[in-house]
């Protein structure tokens, strides 16, 4: 099985023990590590952070001691914006220039492939996204002709039904991608006005339309029905939680909220907590399991957080094995307890290790 793990370059900027550099990563933990994100400037793939090149080197030296490890560079992301991707993909010349710039850039910096993180193609971009993938793959095949190992091509796709329908021609893009990471998280957010888990495995008993689509099981099944081969589908598992501020004394699933949860000490983003911050939060919190959805949430005071723990990730791995998927994807290594100092287990990357162990279990 594949264990595809994202590393985010901006994690270097977190304060104190939250700061994560690629040299903190475990070279034997994942089969693939994806560095997020690269930029595109003047239609050429480019660095984003000022020190990206140094971090690329730091990441890729992990392969010195584990030659089986593959590293990919993810281009795009939330800050890049869909419009910029749209401009490049829809213009034949821009698209060609971008595609041509990728192999030398990846080779120069020691990457084994490219991950496309166009978040997200609009309805009018659907065909352009397919063309971009098809032409990128063709370029990778051509570039590898002189006996080089062919560069890998993957894409991170939304797990939301509405986005899947408008953005992707699943059957066509699947032909050209080496694997597809489906982002089976962020199904529920503060915009809903109530508490809810952002990455449930199954549909909740109370879920009505459109909530019945907002779960991992539906998204995976839908992708498979649309023609994604199970052998190429990698299922996303988050090492972060989504938090809310409760608006009343109600604390269950569906309780009213006044907004996102308070920012974490290190990640500093309202409504989001890294797993290592959740481990801190759990001290003195009340933990519940949403039985049907097979995921936990915790409450403390007026704070509510839905997250994944070692038990829930094992359930998710068992599920992906039952569906004969290609493996699991983790967003992100730097949100797991990468130092092993927060979650009281004397173990670095406890969630990712639990996923790895479950994938290896017979």
């Amino acid at each position: 099985y594949k264990l595809v793990c994202y590393y985010t370059s901006w994690s270097q900027y977190r304060e104190g023990d939250g700061s994560c550099f690629p040299d903190a990563l475990d070279r034997f933990l994942c089969t693939h590590i994806i560095y997020s994100f690269a930029n595109i400037s003047n239609d050429h793939i480019d660095t984003w952070e000022w020190n990206d090149v140094t971090l690329y080197g730091m990441l890729n030296t992990l392969k010195n001691r584990n030659p089986n490890l593959k590293t990919l560079l993810s281009v795009g992301g939330w800050n890049f914006g869909s419009q910029r991707f749209s401009k490049i993909a829809s213009n034949t010349q821009s698209r060609r220039t971008f595609i041509k710039s990728v192999p030398p850039f990846l080779r120069t910096h020691g990457f084994d492939g490219l991950d496309l993180a166009w978040l997200y193609p609009g309805r009018r971009d659907k065909q352009h996204f397919t063309t971009l993938i098809k032409e990128m793959k063709a370029e990778f095949i051509k570039e590898a002709q002189p006996g080089k190992k062919q560069l890998l091509l993957s894409a991170a796709l939304s797990a939301g039904k509405v986005t899947i329908d408008s953005s992707y021609d699943i059957a066509k893009i699947s032909q050209h991608l080496d694997f597809i990471s489906i982002m089976t998280y962020d199904f529920h957010g503060a915009w809903r006005g109530t508490t809810g888990h952002h990455s449930p495995l199954f549909r909740g008993q109370e879920d009505a339309s459109p909530d019945r689509f907002s779960n991992t099981d539906y998204a995976v099944g839908y992708m498979l029905r649309l023609g994604a081969p199970a052998s190429k589908l990698v299922m996303g598992i988050p090492t972060f939680g989504r938090s809310f501020t409760l608006a009343s004394s109600e604390t269950g699933v569906g309780a009213p909220i006044s907004g996102p949860g308070i920012p974490g000490r290190f990640t500093k983003e309202a409504g989001t907590l890294a797993y290592y911050e959740i481990c801190d939060f759990l001290r003195g919190a009340t933990v519940h399991r949403i039985l049907g959805q097979q995921v936990p949430y915790a409450t403390k005071g007026n704070q509510w957080v839905g997250y994944d723990d070692q038990e829930s990730v094992k359930s998710k791995v068992q599920y992906l094995k039952d569906r004969q998927l290609a493996g699991a994807m983790v967003w992100a290594l730097d949100l797991d307890d990468f130092q092993g100092s927060f979650c009281g287990q004397d173990l670095r990357f406890p969630l990712t290790n639990a996923i790895k162990d479950a994938l290896a279990a017979t």
Partner: antibody, heavy 116, light 107 residues
């Protein structure tokens, strides 16, 4: 061996111009952001300017904004600093530095003296 | 702009002493604090980046700590070659700024 070598310094009158160069070798110059840092005689270090690897992003200290221009020629592995409208307070040793996780490689510096 | 204030501006110490230099930022700079050593007539040399990470080839007697606005460079046992001027620098946001320097002299 990774190396940066500055040149172009010298004596110039107030209001005059000078162009500094920094020749890079031993690393893939086009992949790294570069900086200029200066040090007035007997004083501390002052960051002057920065340019991204592609040249698409440029930053200046307020003290030189509008007078100095940073540029690079990746085909020649060279960084430049065009200094116009020079003032006495611009007198300093000018260093170029490579951006790694911070300024991990520095040149030996070139002295610029602004005096009448 | 972010101001960096180093203290002391100079200190006298003997070989074998433990030396501590502090650097304070005018606003939070997360972990984005670097330390450089400079000897007379020479270019600065990177010692520590990102608050506590030792640059390759730098002796382990040098260490850094801190977070947010307050940072420390420690030399656990001062050696003859350590007599120099030390600068902190923030690379959290432009314009990058340096502290005014701390000169470590022989007592």
């Amino acid at each position: 061996e990774v190396q940066l070598v500055e040149s172009g310094g010298g004596l110039v009158q107030p209001g005059g111009s000078l162009r500094l160069s920094c020749a890079a070798s031993g690393f893939t110059f086009s992949s790294y952001a570069m900086h200029w840092v200066r040090q007035a005689p007997g004083k501390g270090l002052e960051w002057v300017s920065a340019i991204s690897s592609s040249g698409g992003s440029i930053y200046y200290a307020d003290s030189v904004k509008g007078r100095f221009t940073i540029s690079r020629d990746n085909s020649k592995n060279t960084l430049y600093l065009q200094m116009n409208s020079l003032r006495a307070e611009d007198t300093a040793v000018y260093y170029c530095a490579k951006q790694g996780l911070s300024f991990d490689i520095w040149g030996q510096g070139t002295l610029v003296t602004v005096s009448s | 702009d972010i101001q960096m204030t180093q203290s002391p501006s100079s200190l006298s110490a003997s070989v074998g002493d433990r030396v501590t230099i502090t650097c304070r930022a005018s606003q939070s700079i997360s972990n984005w604090l670097n330390w450089y050593q400079q000897k007379p007539g020479k270019a600065p040399k990177l010692l520590i980046y990102a608050t506590s990470r030792l640059q390759s080839g730098v002796p382990s007697r040098f260490s850094g700590s801190g977070s947010g606005t307050d940072f420390t460079l420690t030399i656990s046992s001062l050696q003859p070659e350590d007599f120099a001027t030390y600068y902190c620098q923030q690379s959290y946001s432009f314009p990058y700024t340096f502290g005014q320097g701390t000169k470590v002299e022989i007592k």
